[in-house]
């Protein structure tokens, strides 16, 4: 309908116009993680704060048990940042000992679980080798992109090592999605 | 109004439909920084180019004195990248000297100032230890997420060390926001 | 039209209301790169998958020959992540040999080509020195921001070294844009 006056009232306009303010949206923030079981070949999923501080869900976008639940089919922008921190990675210790220095790594995956597919789908992955010289290291991995999702899809954030996630501040580690 | 034809003209439609093209939006780009005073416990704020080159503000989103001014309440996507560059961090020098190797770090914070809260609110933080072996290092920190903002809120980007910010190119260091 | 009922049908409404679902959008994913010639002073451009797996183009946003083609003027959010991987960078080898340790680097540039300007415009750049201790390293560079584009503009992603791009998984290296 771009740039066009409204048609006379007897004509029908089929374009799905809708108010931006009623679109499903969520911004989730980090909480202290409790160890949970996960499949052997799958990274553990983070769980999140969904209503305190900066966190919110709105317009039928709900959070439950590590998952953001997609209430309406459409194109969504999905993003996450995970800040990791740790002590000197084994890599530098191994290097000092003269053994092969295969680097450690940190990985974040935003994963979709859908009724129509038996396997989770990895939507976004950020992965980084960590081979730090310093004794204490910390760094974020940021991800964000647009995906076509179906009503009923579920989104989660998986990490390679839950014990390295910085859960101390809501602005350091977060997860969000909004319908475009 | 999703998927629904327009109602006859005597009916009222209350959804706040609005043209996407008139939403507040800004993309600001780096300029050379001049030292400014800041609170002892707060990182210094960057100032920005708002109209030359790739930079723009539109639809009542204004930039003044380091701040993006939010003209309308709603959900905004906010983003920034800061590229840092420096000489060898002290960490590696300290390490060579055999002293404890506490790493240096670089940090970016997107901060909200609101008239309903006496403290600045940190919306997003990207922080990274820097313990580089090479003599000259450079790297970006990227942040982006969605937040509910109020009319009158002010946004700024704070960094841990203004002298390490790469201000040479508008595509390396930038800050933006748009109403969803 | 914010908060206002529709006007009677004989009145004209000039705001460019339009359905969100018909806006130009694309999410492209990595494919194995074939060496292509490029200008000596310009980084090589990646080519992309545009219809298989997670990749899609819609609503007149088309992909052809490394370029996303902008079908309609407006403000677009543009993003890309490129995951790089390599063996030990020369930097650490050079350092061990006692020579000057100029670091290697990895760079991603999102570039706009427009009819109205003879030179490509660099919209976004992420650049990072690589001076890794470990023998195998890998890391992503993420970029995203909003730009005002014109119908007919073309977007591409350039990288400093195509041979270092991780093309193994569609979630590791990607490129997208959508009209706001």
């Amino acid at each position: 309908l771009k740039g066009q006056e409204f048609a006379p009232s007897h004509q029908q306009v089929y374009a799905p116009l809708r108010a931006d303010g009623d679109k499903p949206r969520a911004h989730l923030t980090v909480v202290r993680q409790t160890p949970t079981q996960h499949f052997k070949n799958q990274f553990p999923a983070l769980h999140w704060e969904h209503e305190l501080g900066l966190a919110f869900t709105k317009n039928r976008m709900n959070y439950t048990n590590k998952f953001l639940l997609i209430p309406e089919s459409g194109d969504y922008f999905i993003y996450s940042q995970v800040t990791f921190r740790g002590m000197t990675s084994e890599c530098s210790e191994i290097r000092q000992a003269g053994r092969p220095n295969k680097p450690d790594s940190i990985t974040v995956v935003i994963t979709k679980v859908t009724d129509s597919y038996p396997e989770p789908t990895q939507l976004l992955m950020g992965t980084k080798s960590v081979c730090e010289v310093g004794s204490n290291w910390f760094q974020p991995i940021y991800l964000g992109a647009m995906f076509s999702l179906q009503e009923g899809d579920k989104l989660m954030v998986n990490v390679s090592d839950i014990s390295l996630v910085d859960y101390t501040k809501e602005d350091k580690t977060f997860f969000g999605a909004f319908l475009l | 109004l999703k998927g629904q034809e327009f109602a006859p003209s005597h009916q009222q439609v209350y959804a706040p439909l609005r043209a996407d093209g008139d939403k507040p939006r800004a993309h600001l780009t780096v300029v050379r920084q001049t030292p400014t005073q800041h609170f002892k416990n707060q990182f210094p704020a960057l100032h920005w180019e708002h109209e030359l080159g790739l930079a723009f503000t539109k639809n009542r989103m204004n930039y003044t004195n380091k701040f993006l001014l939010i003209p309308e309440s709603g959900d905004y996507f906010i983003y920034s990248q800061v590229t840092f560059r420096g000489m060898t961090s002290e960490c590696s020098e300290i390490r060579q000297a055999g002293r404890p190797n506490k790493p240096d770090s670089i940090t970016v914070v997107i901060t909200k100032v609101t008239d309903s809260y006496p403290e600045p609110t940190q919306l997003l933080m990207g922080t990274k230890s820097v313990c580089e072996v090479g003599s000259n290092w450079f790297q970006p920190i990227y942040l982006g997420a969605m937040f509910s903002l109020q009319e009158g809120d002010k946004l700024m980007v704070n960094v841990s060390d203004i002298s390490l910010v790469d201000y040479t190119k508008e595509d390396k260091t930038f800050f933006g926001a748009f109403l969803l | 039209l914010k908060g206002q009922e529709f006007a009677p049908s004989h009145q004209q409404v000039y705001a460019p209301l339009r359905a969100d679902g018909d806006k130009p959008r694309a999410h492209l994913t990595v494919v194995r790169q074939t060496p292509t010639q490029h200008f000596k002073n310009q980084f090589p451009a990646l080519h992309w998958e545009h219809e298989l797996g997670l990749a899609f183009t819609k609503n007149r946003m088309n992909y052809t020959n490394k370029f996303l083609l902008i079908p309609e003027s407006g403000d677009y959010f543009i993003y890309s992540q490129v995951t790089f991987r390599g063996m030990t960078s020369e930097c650490s080898e050079i350092r061990q040999a006692g020579r000057p340790n100029k670091p290697d680097s990895i760079t991603v540039v999102i570039t706009k080509v427009t009819d109205s300007y003879p030179e490509p415009t660099q919209l976004l750049m992420g650049t990072k020195s690589v001076c890794e201790v470990g023998s195998n390293w890998f890391q992503p560079i993420y970029l995203g921001a909003m730009f005002s584009l014109q119908e007919g503009d073309k977007l591409m992603v350039n990288v400093s070294d195509i041979s270092l791009v991780d093309y193994t998984k569609e979630d590791k290296t990607f490129f997208g844009a959508f009209l706001l």
């Epitope: - | 005073q37 609170f39 204004n62 003044t64 004195n65 380091k66 701040f67 001014l69 100032v113 609101t114 008239d115 309903s116 809260y117 006496p118 403290e119 600045p120 009158g152 002010k154 | -």
Partner: antibody, heavy 116, light 106 residues
Framework: QVQLQESGPGLVRPSQTLSLTCTVS????????MHWVRQRPGRGLEWMGR????????KYNPSLKSRVTITRDTSKNQVSLRLSSVTAADTAVYYC?????????WGQGSLVTVSS | DIQMTQSPSSLSASVGDRVTITCRAS?????MYWYQQKPGKAPKLLIY???NLASGVPSRFSGSGSGTDFTFTISSLQPEDIATYYC?????????FGQGTKVEIK
């Protein structure tokens, strides 16, 4: 150290306009918000309005909106209050307050008496 | 307007007593503020965001609550705490204060 100092006439005639200025030292007013609050004798505190010095955007108490104007001069790091058509009921201590993004800082207050 | 109803309007307590003041908003607010005002002085912020202690404020002062019901507590009243205490909401327009609670020593 951040300091706020209200200044202006202590006596205003009925129907005239009350004018006060608040001068801030030690902090850039554009980095925060500036409010005016008044306290009538033996009464509680009444918020009058605020200005965002960065943008000039104001919000006023609706009960005073037709009479109150708050402005700023960023070059002097000052904000000003004007209250028109005053009556004896506007006799009060007027406080300038810096709040929002910074811990509250109040001026010491300026007593204004409305009397003929 | 959001009305702030503060109670009691005055109280008298002994040194060392626990003192509690309540404030009820006529509609839900996210942030509540508590101020102390001593005679002839400007108010001083004690609590912001319902429960955060302002810088330099002794830890005997605390705040709690959410939505419409908020509480301000002095865990052990000291002679220097003689003052009038006000609650304030900063969200609705206009920003409104409670009518004040005058605290005296028995």
């Amino acid at each position: 150290q951040v300091q706020l100092q209200e200044s202006g006439p202590g006596l205003v005639r009925p129907s005239q306009t009350l004018s006060l200025t608040c001068t801030v030292s030690g902090f850039d007013i554009q980095d925060t918000y500036m409010h005016w609050v008044r306290q009538r004798p033996g009464r509680g505190l009444e918020w009058m309005g605020r200005i965002d010095p960065a943008s000039g955007h104001t919000k006023y108490n609706p009960s005073l909106k037709s009479r109150v104007t708050i402005t700023r001069d960023t070059s002097k790091n000052q904000v000003s209050l004007r209250l028109s058509s005053v009556t004896a009921a506007d006799t009060a201590v007027y406080y300038c307050v810096m709040s929002g993004g910074v811990p509250d800082v109040w001026g010491q207050g300026s007593l204004v008496t409305v009397s003929s | 307007d959001i009305q702030m109803t503060q109670s009691p309007s005055s109280l008298s307590a002994s040194v060392g007593d626990r003192v509690t003041i309540t404030c009820r908003a006529s509609q839900g607010v996210e942030y509540m503020y508590w101020y102390q005002q001593k005679p002839g002085k400007a108010p001083k912020l004690l609590i912001y965001g319902a429960s955060n202690l302002a810088s330099g404020v002794p830890s005997r002062f605390s705040g709690s609550g959410s939505g419409t019901d908020f509480t301000f507590t002095i865990s052990s009243l000291q002679p220097e705490d003689i003052a009038t205490y006000y609650c304030q909401q900063w969200e609705g327009n206009p920003r409104t204060f409670g009518q004040g609670t005058k605290v005296e020593i028995k």
